[in-house]
């Protein structure tokens, strides 16, 4: 058993039919010795009475809030949660697999730039009763600062029959250093509580590998005389680290026609102009990538050919 | 070029040759993010190479100020991996074939090197580990990894290199 | 075609050593690696230890301590397997075989014993 | 060192029935989680072995009725209809540690 939060303790529990389950004493905050008595949740039922209770936390139906009384006034609280450790493995009930880039993968992070800020989302089929708190560090065995602020329900879906909710968070590193080489990992740690069961998550890695920079920004066509090809130009997205002499991206043009079985034409560039044939009805569409590392390339920005 | 007393590297011919080392160096292992390098009995194994760090005055502030430092620190790098590349854990087995991209890449690290390094002048280099793994299969994970790291120092080499050719080329 | 030509049967006395030759032809010697596997009358096979020529390593099987020799003649395209203190558990068909041992992008880890010798027995008994 | 324990250690199977041979070994044989450092020889009678599976593909020439599968410590190799030339010794063997190590093999009879 250990704290996770004031008055909030996690049982871990080897999870498999008849399990012994786990002891635990509890002991009420309160400097009273004597008439002190017990109860769980919303129910009158006396547990037992005394400064301490000593209980066998086997299932759900152990969990839940205990609170000691004197009296009819309420002394303290103690929330237990219960996680649960199937053959040797932490239960993943709360979260969605998302499988990308791996199976396993419950949580996604991405940045835009190296200034050291990244976002990072995480899905459940989970809609009540359900909280998240977000740690962050770089390094583990002697961790430097990162902030993170409060999950927030970011999108809702529906999948087949039922609804998908995707929480997500946004968190800083203290003090980023957006030119030096990372040598150690970035550590992300999502404790999850749905009712009374409680599951952490964690996802490591360097912010080189999860930038993905946002579209080019400013996309514009300019016809070159008595040709069918025009000029396109566009700029760096705003988002993107500066300066650009140092922080350049690498780019990828792309002519598509209407049907999405027509053979796309693709330029690579590391200049923000390049010269297309532009075919009636057709699509000009530019994604960046980082032009020194292959991390994740933009999204499309599009313009139409006409 | 960079000798230790001051005078600039060719930064054009860096910044060129630094970005074909991002391309070897990406063409020697594309996969290498989507392997499971969590293997049983896997130390952290590429703790010792040198890092690009926050003080070595690589960012562009740092290369205003003073380009040496910063580049006594890529040529320090460049050193390491160019020996690690010729070392046993890429020379022994599972032997690369003959046209893999780890043989330019070797050649390359140690081309831009000298870019950066006329002989007669020395900068002092770093110590290489002695890495020599027992077994094929962690010669085959420290290629991985060591790989894994030269792609994020070459990132950076090449950051400065084309900084410097669009900044500070005379 | 590939071949792979073993010297040829020896009768050899408790305590005495045995030296294994391996021939190679039909491609270059020094791109492949040569592995020694041997079988006892009715058994399974074992593997003794590989030699590879371009890179100068040598693989053992611990278990032969120290008795088992690998080596390999470029000039002449031939490996050697020497066996010392032989004792009469090691009368066996001692096999060579090319190992082809590589990794690339796509296959980080290819290995095979593609080509084997005819085998030579070696008997030990006093 | 890595025990490859092989089962069973005899099959006579009809001529067209399947055959299932497994290996077994003492630690995960599996690379980066995926790649496969286990592979499968036949040996007949008076020759030496012959690699018929590498990791998890046929060498080129073994007819398709050969199928290998497994990873991590479990592995099998599958004769979907057994023919009268595939009688022989059937032997996996490790290559991801040092010493390498064949099963104790499986022989294959017609019944």
């Known amino acids: 058993i250990w704290e996770l939060k004031k008055d909030v303790y996690v049982v871990e529990l080897d999870w498999y039919p008849d399990a012994p389950g786990e002891m635990v004493v509890l002991t009420c905050d309160t400097p009273e010795e004597d008439g002190i008595t017990w109860t769980l949740d919303q129910s009158s039922e006396v547990l037992g009475s005394g400064k301490t209770l000593t209980i066998q936390v086997k299932e759900f139906g152990d969990a839940g809030q205990y609170t000691c009384h004197k009296g009819g006034e309420v002394l303290s609280h103690s929330l237990l949660l219960l996680h649960k450790k199937e053959d040797g493995i932490w239960s993943t009930d709360i979260l969605k697999d998302q499988k990308e880039p791996k199976n396993k993968t419950f949580l996604r992070c991405e940045a835009k730039n190296y200034s050291g800020r990244f976002t990072c989302w995480w899905l459940t089929t989970i809609s009540t009763d359900l909280t998240f708190s977000v740690k962050s560090s770089r390094g583990s065995s002697d961790p430097q600062g990162v902030t993170c602020g409060a999950a927030t329900l970011s999108a809702e879906r529906v999948r087949g029959d039922n609804k998908e909710y995707e929480y997500s968070v946004e968190c800083q590193e203290d003090s980023a250093c957006p030119a030096a080489e990372e040598s150690l990992p970035i550590e992300v740690m999502v404790d999850a509580v749905h009712k009374l069961k409680y599951e952490n998550y964690t996802s490591s890695f360097f912010i080189r590998d999860i930038i993905k920079p946002d579209p080019p920004k400013n996309l514009q066509l300019k016809p070159l005389k008595n040709s069918r090809q025009v000029e396109v130009s566009w700029e760096y997205p705003d988002t993107w680290s500066t300066p650009h002499s140092y922080f350049s991206l690498t780019f990828c043009v792309q002519v598509q026609g209407k049907s999405k079985r027509e053979k796309k034409d693709r330029v690579f560039t590391d200049k923000t102009s390049a010269t297309v044939i532009c075919r009636k009805n057709a699509s000009i569409s530019v994604r960046a990538q980082d032009r020194y590392y292959s991390s994740s390339w933009s999204e499309w920005a599009s313009v139409p050919c006409s | 070029r960079a000798v230790p007393g001051g005078s600039s590297p060719a930064w054009t011919q860096c910044q060129q040759l630094s970005q074909k080392l991002c391309t070897l160096a990406w063409s020697a292992h594309p996969l290498v993010g989507h392997m499971d390098l969590r293997e049983e009995g896997d130390e952290e194994t590429t703790n010792d190479v040198p890092h690009i760090q926050c003080g070595d005055g690589c960012d562009p502030q740092g290369l205003r100020d003073n380009s040496q430092f910063c580049l006594q620190r890529i040529h320090q790098g460049l050193i390491f991996y160019e020996k690690l590349l010729g070392s046993d854990i890429f020379t022994g087995e599972p032997s690369l074939l003959p046209d893999s991209p780890v043989g330019q890449l070797h050649a390359s690290l140690l081309g831009l090197s000298q870019l950066l390094q006329p002989e007669g002048h020395h900068w002092e280099t770093q110590q290489i580990p002695s890495l020599s793994p027992s077994q094929p299969w962690q010669r085959l994970l420290l290629r991985f990894k060591i790989l894994r790291s030269l792609q994020a120092f070459v990132a950076v080499a090449a950051r400065v290199f084309a900084h410097g050719a669009a900044t500070l080329s005379p | 075609q590939v071949q792979l030509v073993q010297s040829g049967a020896e009768v050899k006395k408790p305590g005495s050593s045995v030296k294994v030759s391996c021939k190679a032809s039909g491609y270059t010697f020094a791109s492949y690696g040569i592995t020694w596997v041997r079988q006892a009358p009715g058994q399974g096979l074992e593997w003794m230890g590989e030699?590879?020529?371009?890179?100068?390593?040598?693989y053992y099987n611990e278990k032969f301590k120290g008795r088992v020799t690998i080596t390999a003649d470029k000039s002449t395209s031939t490996a050697y397997m020497e066996l010392s203190s032989l004792r009469s558990e090691d009368t066996a068909v001692y096999y060579c075989?090319?190992?082809?041992?590589?990794?690339?992008?796509?296959?980080?880890?290819?290995?095979?014993?593609?080509?084997w010798g005819q085998g030579t027995l070696v008997t030990v008994s006093s | 060192d890595i025990v490859m324990t092989q089962s069973p250690d005899s099959l006579a199977v009809s001529l067209g029935e399947r055959a299932t041979i497994n290996c077994k070994a003492s630690k995960k044989v599996t690379i980066f989680g995926s790649t496969s450092a286990l592979h499968w020889y036949q040996q007949k009678p008076g020759q030496p072995p012959k690699l018929i599976y590498n990791?998890?593909k046929p060498e080129s020439g073994v007819p398709d009725r050969f199928s290998g599968s497994g990873s991590g410590t479990d592995f099998t190799l599958t004769i979907s209809s057994l023919q009268a030339e595939d009688v022989a010794v059937y032997y996996c063997?490790?290559?991801?540690?040092?010493?390498?190590?064949f099963g104790g093999g499986t022989k294959v009879e017609i019944k």
């Open positions: 075989a090319r190992a082809e041992f590589i990794s690339t992008v796509v296959a980080p880890y290819y290995y095979a014993l593609d080509y």
């Open positions: 063997l490790q290559n991801k540690e040092v010493p390498y190590t």
């Open positions: 990791g998890a």
């Open positions: 030699n590879y020529p371009r890179s100068g390593n040598t």
